[in-house]
């Protein structure tokens, strides 16, 4: 599809990277953005650069020199970006390709002005990776009196995420936003499906459970079985087969 | 963090050559010029010249013509600095600096201890 | 070749004088200027540069001011630590030159 070179191919992917995948707030000088993992990405400052500069340097972290212009040429040095950054020197843009986690830092845009002064700006890069699916794992499930007691745990391997409750798609109230959903349901308000949906701030992925009578297991969407699967449906299976 | 550590000092006979070496770390070596600088017992400073850790590009002050050499080795992030034909005003301590960028813009933000070069007979 | 000279050559001051130091340059030079501090058998620091612009690390009552031929530095509140002397250097053109430094001596 690109045949017009890595240049073109990555002005065409960041146009067409999605919102979502890019978050920007901007504080004072420094300017905050968070992307998702594997994505390419532009650093560039809101401003024109000064006129006619005398020298560009970019660099991560403070004293780590990514890539120079001094108005003959640009000069990349060793660093782990070596081969994923271009630098556009008209806007001073810098361009990354598939960034990583570790490339979380505070990205620096130095600028000598011909005159003899400096200008410089930050940009602190955050990198997320996209939130895993996450499973629901049933705690405990009790008929009490025609109320149901429902424990449910959403589960995703270590990460710092958000986590939203929906009972047949509508949202439990905030306070029982957290990874784990304890309630006790009375009759009229239950729900047949129970879904809980992880996300950050770059992507977000939800898991389904749903009950069949109300206060018993059922089948669930995009969602992995643990051992409380099997209490709930093998005797279930079992029974079916036996009659 | 930054830093630079010159060699040791030296005693020369007027006529011998001194190598001084300048080894750095906490940077991108390459990344930015080293400017060499004396200053004789009692006095100011002088600038003596600058190389180009990126490409080896040199400058010189125009006294010191033919008789300075500095270098670079990026494979040990050390520049050095050579001084022929001493002669006793020679005798100076001397200075390796980092300069901002790898096009020199003339301001050294980190110093090297110094290196103290006397020369007598 | 640029001269920079730097008047006084040297200032007796007290703790919390105000005290200017000024740098003239034969030629206009934008304000390609550094000023540094160099205290008795230590390296030069950098304190200004770009004639106003202070170095990181820096103390605020440090700052700088001028362009083209006539620079100044001015120490709002003199600390015992700033007891030391001052260089400029110009940056505007090979070969770098220095001024010929200013004395700043306890009174």
């Known amino acids: 599809m690109c045949s017009r070179g890595w240049d073109s191919c990555l002005a065409l992917e960041l146009l067409l990277l999605p919102l979502s995948l890019l978050v920007t707030s901007i504080q004072g000088h420094l300017v905050h953005m968070t992307v998702v993992s594997g994505s390419n990405v532009t650093l560039n400052i809101s401003e024109s650069l000064p006129e006619n500069y005398k020298q560009l340097t970019w660099f991560y972290t403070f004293d780590q020199k990514i890539v120079e212009w001094d108005s003959r040429k640009s000069k990349y040095f060793e660093s782990k970006f070596k081969g994923r950054v271009r630098l556009d020197p008209q806007s001073g843009a810098l361009y990354i390709s598939k960034v990583q986690k570790e490339d979380n830092s505070t990205y620096i845009m130095r600028v000598l002005k011909k005159t003899g002064n400096e200008q410089e700006w930050k940009i602190k890069l955050q990198v997320l990776d996209p939130v895993p699916k996450p499973v629901i794992k049933i705690e405990k499930i009790e008929d009490m009196d025609d109320n149901c007691y429902l424990k449910l745990s959403c589960v995703i391997p270590g990460e710092s995420v958000n986590y939203t409750w929906y009972g047949d798609k509508r949202p439990f109230p905030k306070e029982l936003q957290n990874s784990v959903l304890e309630t006790t349901l009375m009759p009229h308000n239950y729900s047949r499906c129970y879904t809980c949906q992880v996300s950050n701030s770059v992507s977000s992925k939800n898991g389904t459970v749903c009950l069949s009578p109300p206060c018993t297991l059922a089948r669930s969407f995009g969602v992995e079985w643990i051992a409380s699967w099997l209490v709930v449906t093998v005797p279930t299976i079992l029974g079916l087969l036996l009659t | 963090q930054v830093r630079l550590v010159e060699s040791g000092a030296e005693v020369k006979k007027p006529g011998a050559s001194v190598k001084v070496s300048c080894k750095t770390s906490?940077?991108?070596?390459?990344?930015?010029?080293i400017t060499w600088v004396r200053q004789a017992p009692g006095r100011g400073l002088e600038w003596m010249g600058w190389?180009?850790?990126?490409?080896?590009?040199?400058d010189y002050a125009q006294s010191l013509q033919g008789r300075v050499t500095m270098t670079t080795d990026t494979s040990t992030s050390t520049a050095y600095m050579e001084l022929r034909s001493l002669r006793s005003d020679d005798t100076a301590m001397y200075y390796c600096?980092?300069?901002?960028?790898?096009?020199?813009?003339?301001?050294?933000?980190?110093w090297g201890q110094g290196t103290l070069v006397t020369v007598s007979s | 070749a640029i001269q920079l000279t730097q008047s006084p050559s040297s200032v007796s001051a007290s703790v919390g004088d105000r005290v200017t130091i000024t740098c003239r340059a034969s030629?206009?030079?934008?304000?390609?200027l550094a000023w540094y501090q160099q205290k008795p058998g230590k390296a030069p620091k950098l304190l200004m540069f770009?004639?106003?612009s202070l170095q990181s690390g820096v103390p605020s009552r440090f700052s700088g001011s001028g362009s083209g031929t006539d620079f100044i530095l001015t120490i709002s509140s003199l600390q015992p630590e700033d007891f030391a002397t001052y260089y400029c250097?110009?940056?505007?053109?090979?070969?770098?030159?220095f001024g010929q430094g200013t004395k700043v001596e306890i009174k």
């Open positions: 600096a980092r300069d901002r960028y790898s096009s020199s813009s003339g301001y050294f933000d980190y």
């Open positions: 906490g940077y991108t070596f390459a990344g930015y010029g």
């Open positions: 190389v180009s850790a990126y490409n080896g590009d040199t």
């Open positions: 030629q206009g030079i934008s304000s390609w």
């Open positions: 770009g004639a106003s």
């Open positions: 250097q110009q940056a505007n053109s090979f070969p770098y030159s």
